[in-house]
C-alpha cells in the first residue's frame, strides 16, 4: 500500500502500512515523513540517505530496538525527530550524529534508563528534549548539557526520580540556561537536598503528582529554596493518586523562592483559607488556580499584590468577592457554582474574561459592576441571561467586547453602545438579539469588527443600522433569517473588507446594495436560497472584490434566468468552490454544476 | 460487526462496537460494573493512541429507546495544565490509566441505551476513535 501524499513532494503519511524497511519510492524533496506504527525494528547507518531535505521525521511505535551509528547521518536539515514508544535496547554512541539542525527530540517511552548514556551532547541546536515516561532514576544533568546552550524545554515527567541532590544541577551553575522549562511531574519524589536549586534560574518548573504525602511535599518544596523561577506549576492529576491532606504548611517553603507566576493545577481538596495558604505568594505578578474547589470566596478581597488572577474550571459556593487594587487582568472562566455575578472592585483592571460560567447579570454594564474605569477587554461570552440596563458608563476605554452565546435582554430599548467610541471589536453572535431599533450601534465610531451571526431582525429586514460604523472592516450577518435588506444598508461602510451574508433566506441576488463598498474583498452568500437575480440587469460588484461565495444556493437553471446564469459565468474569476454551485431546478438539471451549463435558450423552451 | 462485552451489573449489561474504519485496539474495564440506579467505581483504559491526546474531547450521541438526544460535547483536555495526566500522552505512547467515577440519584427507564462516543484530538482536529456503547437496562432485575 502506498504512502498518502499530503502535500505533493513535501509531506508523506506512511503510518501503519506494515513497512519493514524505509520506503525508497518517495521524492528526494520530502520534508515531512510519518513512518509511525511500522515494524522497522532496526535502523542501520544512513537509513535516510534518500531524504536529504527531511525536516520532520516521525518514527513513533516502529518497534525499533537498535539504532546504529550514523542512522540519521544525511539529515542535516532535520528539526524534529520523534521516537515515541520504541523499545530501544541498543543506541550507538553516534546514533544521532549528523543532526546539525535538530531542535526537537522526542524519546518518550523508549526504555531510557539514564541521561548520562544518552548520546546527544553534540546536538547544539536542540531546543526541546522530551524523555518522559522512561526509567530514569537520577536527575543528574550530565556535563554534556553545557553544550546544549539553546535548550528551552526538558520534559522528565513520568520517570523514576526519587531524589535531587546539589550535584545534580552543577552544570546549570556553570552555564545558566535562563530560558529552561523543566517538567518533573509524576516522578515519585521524596527528597530534594536543600541548596540543590540555590541560584538556579528557570523559566518554568512543573511539579504535579510528585509527592505521596503532605510531609514529603513540605520538605521537597523547602528543598527548592533559592530557586528563581518565572512560572511555577504545582498540583495533581485527577486520575492519579492524590494527597489525603493539604494545608497551609505545604506551601510555606515557597517564601524562599523568587516566583513571577504561580499556578496550582487540580487539587482533590477543599481550599478553605487561601490567605494563609498562599501567604508566600502575595506578591507574585500572576496567580492561577485551575480545577480546585474554593470554600471561602471572600478571601479574594485580601490585599494580594497580583496583577493577573486566573480562576479556571474551579468550584465556588458563590461568585467570589473580588477587591484587588493592583489587579490588571482577571480570567474567570468555566467555573461552577455562584451563578449570579456580583459586583467586583478592581480599580486597575484592564482585561476581564468572564466567559463560560453560566453567569447571569441583572444589570450590565457600567463602571460600578467592575469597579474600574480602565477596562479595555471584556469577554462575557457563553453565559446566561445578561440584561442590558446601562450603556457602559465609565467603561469608555473598552476596545474589545464579546457577548457571543449569552442571552442578551433589552438590546433594542436604547443605544446600548453609545459610550464606546474606542471599541474596535464587538461580538454579539447567537445572543437572541432581535434588532428592532435602528440606533442599536450608535456611538461605535471606531469599530472595525462586528460579529452578529445567529440573531434576528424585525420583519427579517436589514435596515440602515450601520450608518456610524465608518471604520468597519469585518461584518458577519450569517444565520440571521434575513430575507430583504435596505438598498442603503451598507452605504457608509467604505472600509469594509469582509461581509458574511451566508445562511440567510434570500431568494434573489442584488448587486445594488454593495455599490459603495469600495474596499470589499470577500462576500459570502453561501447557504441561502438564491434562485435568480433581483433585477434582470445585474451590475458589477465593487472592483476590489476578490472572493464571491455563492455555493449551496437554489439556482434555477431555466431559460428565463439565462442572463443571471450568464452573469454568474462572467464572475468566474471571483467565485470560490464553484463545484458546489449546483442547479436546484428543474429536475433534469438538479445537481449539475452551474458553470458547466451550456446556457442557450434551447433550455426548456 | 464484532461486539465487545464490558460487564454486567444487577441492572445493566454493557458492550461496545467500533464505529470507525480503523478499529485500533482499546481495552476498557469497569470495576465494579456500572449500576444505573447509583454507581461508584473505577474505569480502566489501556490504549495506544494514533495521535497526540492534546485537546481531546468527546462528541456524545445518545439514543434512549430509539429517541435521539442532542449531541453533547465533553472537553477532556483543554490543552495546558489539564486535569488528567493522559492529556499529555503522545501518539504511540501507552495510555494505561484508571479514572474514578460516581453518580447517584438518576432514575433511568427500562430499555436500550446507545451512546456513540467520538473521540477527537490534536491540531488540526481529527478523530481518534469511535465506539458505540450499548447499555441494556433492566431496572428490577436482581
Amino acid at each position: 500500500e502506498p504512502c498518502v501524499e499530503v502535500v505533493p513532494n513535501i509531506t508523506y503519511q506512511c503510518m501503519e502500512l506494515n513497512f519493514y524497511k524505509i520506503p525508497d519510492n518517495l521524492p528526494f524533496s520530502t520534508k515531512n515523513l510519518d513512518l509511525s506504527f511500522n515494524p522497522l525494528r532496526h535502523l542501520g547507518s544512513y537509513s535516510f540517505f534518500s531524504f536529504p531535505e527531511l525536516q520532520v521525521l516521525d518514527l513513533s511505535r516502529c518497534e525499533i530496538q537498535t539504532i546504529e551509528d550514523g542512522a540519521y547521518q544525511s539529515l542535516s536539515h532535520l528539526s524534529t525527530l520523534i521516537l515515541t514508544g520504541n523499545p530501544i535496547q541498543s543506541l550507538a554512541l553516534g546514533a544521532f550524529s549528523g543532526l546539525s539542525s535538530l531542535q526537537k527530540l522526542v524519546a518518550v517511552e523508549t526504555n531510557l534508563a539514564s541521561l548520562e548514556n544518552f548520546p546527544i551532547g553534540h546536538l547544539k541546536t536542540l531546543k526541546e528534549l522530551n524523555v518522559a515516561h522512561n526509567l530514569i532514576q537520577s536527575f543528574k544533568l550530565p556535563e554534556y548539557f553545557s553544550n546544549l546552550t539553546n535548550l528551552e524545554h526538558l520534559d522528565l515527567s513520568s520517570n523514576k526520580i526519587q531524589s535531587i541532590y546539589c550535584t545534580d544541577l552543577r552544570v546549570l551553575h556553570q552555564m545558566p540556561l535562563l530560558n529552561l522549562s523543566l517538567d518533573l511531574s509524576l516522578n515519585p519524589m521524596n527528597f530534594i537536598q536543600p541548596g540543590a536549586f540555590k541560584e538556579i534560574r528557570l523559566h518554568k518548573l512543573t511539579l504535579r503528582n510528585n509527592f505521596d504525602s503532605l510531609n514529603v511535599m513540605k520538605t521537597c518544596i523547602q528543598g527548592l529554596a533559592g530557586l528563581e523561577v518565572h512560572r511555577l506549576v504545582l498540583g495533581e492529576f485527577r486520575n492519579e493518586g492524590n494527597l489525603e491532606k493539604f494545608d497551609k504548611s505545604a506551601l510555606e517553603g515557597l517564601c524562599n523562592l523568587t516566583i513571577e507566576e504561580f499556578r496550582l493545577a487540580y487539587l482533590d481538596y477543599y481550599l478553605d483559607d487561601i490567605i494563609d495558604l498562599f501567604n508566600c505568594l502575595t506578591n507574585v505578578s500572576s496567580f492561577s488556580l485551575v480545577s480546585v474547589t474554593i470554600e471561602r470566596v471572600k478571601d479574594f478581597s485580601y490585599n494580594f499584590g497580583w496583577q493577573h488572577l486566573e480562576l479556571v474550571n474551579c468550584k465556588f459556593g458563590q461568585f467570589p468577592t473580588l477587591k484587588l487594587k493592583s489587579l490588571k487582568r482577571l480570567t474567570f472562566t468555566s467555573n461552577k457554582g455562584g451563578n449570579a455575578f456580583s459586583e467586583v472592585d478592581l480599580p486597575s483592571l484592564e482585561f476581564l474574561d468572564l466567559s463560560r460560567n453560566g453567569l447571569s447579570f441583572k444589570g450590565c454594564c457600567s463602571q460600578s459592576d467592575f469597579g474600574t474605569t480602565s477596562l479595555k477587554y471584556l469577554d462575557l461570552s457563553f453565559n446566561g441571561v445578561i440584561t442590558m440596563s446601562s450603556n457602559f458608563l465609565g467603561l469608555e476605554q473598552l476596545e474589545h467586547l464579546d457577548f457571543q452565546h449569552s442571552n442578551l435582554k433589552q438590546m433594542s430599548e436604547f443605544s446600548v453602545f453609545l459610550s464606546l467610541r474606542n471599541l474596535i471589536y464587538l461580538d454579539i453572535s447567537h445572543t437572541h438579539t432581535r434588532v428592532a431599533f435602528n440606533g442599536i450601534f450608535n456611538g461605535l465610531s471606531s469599530l472595525e469588527v462586528l460579529k452578529m451571526a445567529g440573531n434576528s431582525f424585525q420583519e427579517n429586514f436589514l435596515p440602515d443600522i450601520f450608518t456610524e460604523l465608518r471604520n468597519l472592516t469585518f461584518l458577519d450577518l450569517s444565520q440571521c433569517q434575513l430575507e430583504q435588506l435596505s438598498p442603503t444598508a451598507f452605504n457608509s461602510l467604505s472600509s469594509l473588507q469582509v461581509l458574511n451574508m451566508s445562511h440567510n433566506n434570500f431568494f434573489s441576488l442584488d448587486t445594488f446594495p454593495y455599490k459603495c463598498l469600495n474596499s470589499l474583498q470577500v462576500l459570502d452568500y453561501s447557504l441561502n436560497h438564491i434562485m435568480t437575480s433581483k433585477k434582470q440587469e445585474l451590475q458589477h460588484f465593487p472592483s476590489s472584490l476578490a472572493f464571491l461565495n455563492l455555493t449551496q444556493n437554489d439556482f434555477a437553471c431555466t431559460c428565463e434566468h439565462q442572463s443571471f446564469l450568464q452573469w454568474i459565468k462572467d464572475q468566474r474569476q471571483l467565485l470560490v468552490e464553484v463545484e458546489r454551485m449546483e442547479c436546484a431546478t428543474p429536475s433534469d438539471k438538479q445537481g449539475m454544476p452551474v458553470l458547466s451549463l451550456n446556457i442557450t435558450c434551447q433550455m426548456n423552451k | 460487526q464484532k461486539q465487545y462485552w464490558v460487564c454486567n451489573s444487577s441492572d445493566a449489561s454493557i458492550s461496545y462496537t467500533y464505529c470507525d474504519k480503523m478499529q485500533y485496539p482499546i481495552s476498557i474495564n469497569v470495576n465494579p460494573c456500572i449500576e444505573l440506579k447509583r454507581s461508584k467505581g473505577l474505569l480502566h483504559i489501556f490504549y495506544i493512541p494514533r495521535r497526540d491526546l492534546k485537546q481531546l474531547y468527546f462528541n456524545l450521541y445518545i439514543t434512549v429507546n430509539t429517541m435521539n438526544l442532542p449531541k453533547r460535547k465533553e472537553v477532556i483536555c483543554r490543552g495546558s495544565d489539564d486535569d488528567y495526566s493522559f492529556c499529555r500522552a503522545l501518539k504511540g505512547e501507552t495510555v494505561n490509566t484508571t479514572i474514578s467515577f460516581s453518580f447517584k440519584g438518576i432514575k433511568f427507564s427500562k430499555g436500550k441505551y446507545k451512546c456513540v462516543v467520538e473521540a477527537i484530538s490534536g491540531s488540526p482536529e481529527e478523530m481518534l476513535f469511535c465506539l458505540e456503547f450499548v447499555i441494556l437496562h433492566q431496572p428490577n432485575s436482581n
Epitope: E459, N460, E483, H503, N505, F506, F507, L527 | -
Partner: nanobody, 119 residues
Framework: EVQLVESGGGLVQAGGSLRLSCVAS????????MGWFRQAPGKERDIVAR????????YYAESVRGRFTISRDNAKNTVYLQMNSLRPEDTAVYYC????????????WGQGTQVTVSS
C-alpha cells in the same frame, strides 16, 4: 416525519381559476420556505412559486407571474396556490414542497395533485 398533502386540483376551463392547498403534518413548518412545483407530461419537474416562512419573500416562475399567487397560513400549517387565468399549458401534476427546518432546500414533497386545463 413530515407529511405534505395537496388538494384542490381538478379539471377547469381555460381562463378559469383553482386554489390548491397543502397541509403539513408531523411537525410545524411555520419557519421554513415552502413552494409549489409542477410536472407536465413529458416535461421536467420545475418550480412554480415559493414563499418564505414569514411570507415576506416570494418567487414566481416567469410563466405564471401575475396570474398565480402563493400564500400561507402558519397557524394552519398550510400553503396555498391561487391560480387565475389558467391556460392549457398549465396542465400538470402540482407538487407541494417544503424545506427542512435545518434549511435544506426542497426536502419534503407531497404526492401531487392533478390540474387539467381544457381549451
Amino acid at each position: 416525519e413530515v407529511q405534505l398533502v395537496e388538494s384542490g386540483g381538478g379539471l377547469v376551463q381555460a381562463g378559469g381559476s383553482l386554489r390548491l392547498s397543502c397541509v403539513a403534518s408531523g411537525r410545524s413548518l411555520s419557519t421554513v420556505n415552502m413552494g409549489w412545483f409542477r410536472q407536465a407530461p413529458g416535461k421536467e419537474r420545475d418550480i412554480v412559486a415559493r414563499i418564505s416562512g414569514s411570507s415576506i419573500s416570494t418567487y414566481y416562475a416567469e410563466s405564471v407571474r401575475g396570474r398565480f399567487t402563493i400564500s400561507r397560513d402558519n397557524a394552519k400549517n398550510t400553503v396555498y396556490l391561487q391560480m387565475n387565468s389558467l391556460r392549457p399549458e398549465d396542465t400538470a401534476v402540482y407538487y407541494c414542497v417544503a424545506d427542512s427546518p435545518g434549511g435544506r432546500s426542497y426536502e419534503f414533497w407531497g404526492q401531487g395533485t392533478q390540474v387539467t386545463v381544457s381549451s
